[in-house]
Structure formats: C-alpha cells, structure tokens
C-alpha cells in the first residue's frame, strides 16, 4: 500500500521529502531501483539504478536540485533532499522502490505532498492625490507571496470586515512564480475614516495588516500610510 505524507517548505529553502523503511532495514544498492517522480505528470525528479551513475532521465527542472543519500539508501532511507524550493515544486511526489532480487516487486511506495509558501511583503496602502468629494479610493499592494492570497479591507474603528463588493482585486503571477496582489477599495467618504488592508496567507496562517486613517480634509495625505515599514504604529503583523 502507498503511504501518504505532507510537508511544507518556504520558497528558496531546502526540504526533505521522507521515504523510508522501518529502522534496522538494510538494502544492497546493487539490488534496489529507486524512483522519485511527480505523481500527476510523472516528471522524473531523480532515481537510483544499480551499476548506472547516469541521471540522463532527470527532468531539467530538478537536475542538480534533487538528491538521495547512498548511505541513507543502504539503511532503507530513500528520502529526497530538494534544494532551493520553487513555487513550481508544489506537487505530489511519488517515491517507488523495487527489489530486483524479489523479481522487481515494489517494496516501498510513498506519496509526499509538498506545500510551498512565501511571505508576502508588508502591504503598502495609498490614496490618489485628488479624491472626489463623496468617494475615496484606496490601493493596497503586496508582492512576492505564495500561495495566492486573500485580501480583506477592515473598518479599524470596530474591526469589522468591509463589504467585498467594494474592492477589486488583481492578482498577478510574477516572473519568479510568486503572487503580487493589488486591491483597490472604493468607499464613501466619512469623517475620520480608519481602515486597514489585510493580506492573508492561508498556508502560513499569517495576516499582514496595514492601517490607514483619513480626516475630513482632502489634502490630509500625511495620515495615509505610504511606506508602512517606516510607520511602525500603522503596521500590524498578525499571526493566528
């Protein structure tokens, strides 16, 4: 039977995908055939074949990034070390071990689901220079996160969520395979409007919230968080 496991890794980090027999197992590297493939597309990640050092079959995306330990394999540990994790690595990986002395029977089958995450940048909230008399437009930008984020606008006065119909979110997949998000909020002008933009990374269980406060004066731009990193009292990073 195939064992199922899950593991989480940050983009750019290294991760171990576990595939091992019970402790005390011993394997002859001249007997075992070991394969790591992606479960869906059957992309070849790495493999071990007796008396064959060539890895010609390894997919270019995984070449020189995926390794098994020969010493570990002799102990029955066929775990995969994957270096410099990318968003494209968010896959199900299948480890398959066959014994030629057992007539090429499978002796181990493990599927490891890799979940990939990256922290979004602290959101930047801005408003236009010349807002209309009756409506304010806020823009919230956050970049280089993974997976796809949820964006919420919050009325900071009572911490209630604003109606999502008021916001228009655009999510881009950037050249690094990470997500950038821009959320535009159009809201009726009210006195001392105190709102926040919240970027939620569900996988990391992380919320990044930036507050923005406006008074009655149209020109009161100093209350708007242009650079939330330097305006520490306006930036809240919430972990739940």
């Amino acid at each position: 039977d195939t064992q199922e496991k899950e593991v989480r890794a940050m983009v750019g980090s290294d991760v171990e995908l576990s595939c091992a027999c019970p402790e005390g197992s011993r394997f002859d590297l001249n007997d075992v055939y070991v394969y790591w493939q992606t479960s869906e597309s059957k992309t070849v990640v790495t493999y071990h074949i007796p008396q064959n050092s060539s890895l010609d079959n390894v997919d270019s995306h995984y070449r020189n990034r995926a390794l098994m330990s020969p010493a570990g394999m002799q102990r029955g540990d066929f775990s995969l070390r994957l270096f410099n994790v990318t968003p494209q690595d968010e896959q199900k990986f299948h480890c398959l071990v066959l014994s030629q002395s057992l007539g090429f029977q499978e002796v181990l089958s493990v599927v490891v689901t890799l979940h990939v995450a990256a922290n979004f940048s602290v959101p930047v909230v801005s408003i236009p220079h010349n807002p209309s008399q009756d409506e304010l437009t806020f823009t919230c930008t956050s970049i280089n996160g993974y997976p796809r984020p949820n964006v919420y606008w919050i009325n900071k006065t009572d911490n209630s969520l604003l109606d999502q119909a008021l916001q228009n979110d655009t999510v881009f997949l950037n050249t690094r395979g990470l997500y950038d998000v821009v959320s535009v909020l159009r809201i009726a002008r009210t006195p001392s409007l105190n709102i926040g933009c919240c970027i939620e990374n569900v996988l990391l269980r992380q919320n990044l919230t930036v507050g923005s406060q406006t008074g009655n004066s149209i020109g009161e731009r100093d209350k708007i968080t242009e650079n939330p990193v330097s305006t520490r009292e306006k930036t809240e990073v919430t972990w739940s």
Partner: antibody, heavy 121, light 107 residues
Framework: EVQLVESGGGLVQPGGSLRLSCAGS????????MSWVRQAPGKGLEWVAY????????YYVDSVKGRFTISRDNAKKSLYLQMNSLRAEDTAVYYC??????????????WGQGILVTVSS | DIQMTQSPSSLSASVGDRVTITCRAS??????LAWYQQKPEKAPKSLIY???SLQSGVPSRFSGSGSGTDFTLTISSLQPEDFATYYC?????????FGQGTKVEIK
C-alpha cells in the same frame, strides 16, 4: 505479487472489432509504461503498442497504425487495446506487459499470460 | 527503432552441451538487454536482464554477457527443460524491440 490479466480475446471476422483489456495488480500501475506485444502462431514476439504513464505518449508498430488504439485508466489499473478493421494477419496471442518507469534503460518487461485473438471468417 | 539481430535462428544440441546464442543491436544500447525463454503455449519467462544479471529463481547455468551492440546468452550445460525458444530484447529506448528468436532443439 505483480499480476497482469488479459481479457476480451476471441474469434472475430475480418473487418470486425475487438477490445482487449488488461487488469494490473500488485504494483503502482500509474507509474509504469505499459505495452501490448503479440505473437502470431509459430512466429516471434512483435511489439504492437506502447503508452506512457499519463497516456500522453503512444507508439504503434506500422502495421496497426490507424486501426489499433492503446489507452489506459490508471484509476482502474487497466490497460486497453481497441482493435478495428481486423485482418487475418492480426491473429495472434496478445500479451499485456508492464514496462519501465524511465524513458530509457531501467526495468525489464513483466509479462501477462496472454490471450488469443483469432481473425477468421 | 533499434533493430535486434539474433543468431542462429535455430540450433540442435544434446543434454550437457554448452550452447551460445548471440544478439546484435543496430546501435549502442549500453547494457539494457534482456533474454527470455519461451515454451509452447506459454508466456515468455525472464532469464537475464541488464545483459548479465540473472533473474531470481533462474538456474546459474544461464549467463549473459556483452555491452554496447554485441551480446551473448550462454547455457553452460543444457538440460532437458531448456529446450525452448530464446529471445533477446533491448530496453534502452521505446519501442522495446526483440530479436527474431532462437529455437533450441534436441539433437
């Protein structure tokens, strides 16, 4: 234990159709290339068709191109060979075979027991 | 496709004889060669894989050698149960192709 069991063979008239099935067990079916190999009476082994793990690559011997279709259902651990416009020269024992995992150079072929297809009027 | 040429196509031998069958590939296949034994009305049985590795349960009188394009199957001392047809098969690339077979008959 690895097992491949063929079914669907029998007697069919020239120009007729037949669908062979092969049920795999004892291995992770979706991880392997699979094939059909045939052997006409008193003749040698001839590969008929190959199919990659995800079904996206298929190869056919010239003599069956356009008439035979290889397919697989990984969820059912099953391999199929749809044979149309059958000819007398298609009469043979058809073997279902488990092949390798890589594109080249890894596992030897594992054979089913075979099933007879007879094309005759 | 890689062509496999097997010789001889048939041979007559006696019990206890040493028998050699050769197989030549039309291009280099490293050591990705298998040998099968087939008896009438039976599926092929794996004898040798990776040119020289003996399949588990196969008697040690069977041996294989060769690399690249030229390969040999040797039966060191022919036994009554060894009278059968033998096939080579390359599994360096798809489609995996077969030699035409060598029938080993009783002299």
């Amino acid at each position: 234990e690895v097992q491949l069991v063929e079914s669907g063979g029998g007697l069919v008239q020239p120009g007729g159709s037949l669908r062979l099935s092969c049920a795999g067990s004892g291995f992770t079916f979706s991880s392997y290339w699979m094939s059909w190999v045939r052997q006409a009476p008193g003749k040698g082994l001839e590969w008929v068709a190959y199919i990659k793990q995800d079904g996206n690559e298929k190869y056919y011997v010239d003599s069956v191109k356009g008439r035979f279709t290889i397919s697989r259902d990984n969820a059912k651990k099953s391999l199929y060979l749809q044979m149309n416009s059958l000819r007398a020269e298609d009469t043979a024992v058809y073997y279902c075979a488990r092949e390798g995992i890589l594109w080249f150079g890894d596992l030897p072929t594992f054979w089913g027991q075979g099933i007879l297809v007879t094309v005759s009027s | 496709d890689i062509q496999m040429t097997q010789s001889p196509s048939s041979l007559s031998a006696s019990v206890g004889d040493r028998v050699t069958i050769t197989c030549r590939a039309s291009q280099g296949i490293s050591n990705w060669l298998a040998w099968y034994q087939q008896k009438p009305e039976k599926a092929p049985k794996s004898l040798i894989y990776a040119a020289s590795s003996l399949q588990s349960g196969v008697p040690s009188r069977f041996s294989g050698s060769g690399s690249g394009t030229d390969f040999t199957l040797t039966i060191s001392s022919l036994q009554p149960e060894d009278f059968a047809t033998y096939y080579c098969q390359q599994y360096d690339s798809y489609p995996r192709t077969f030699g035409q077979g060598t029938k080993v008959e009783i002299k």
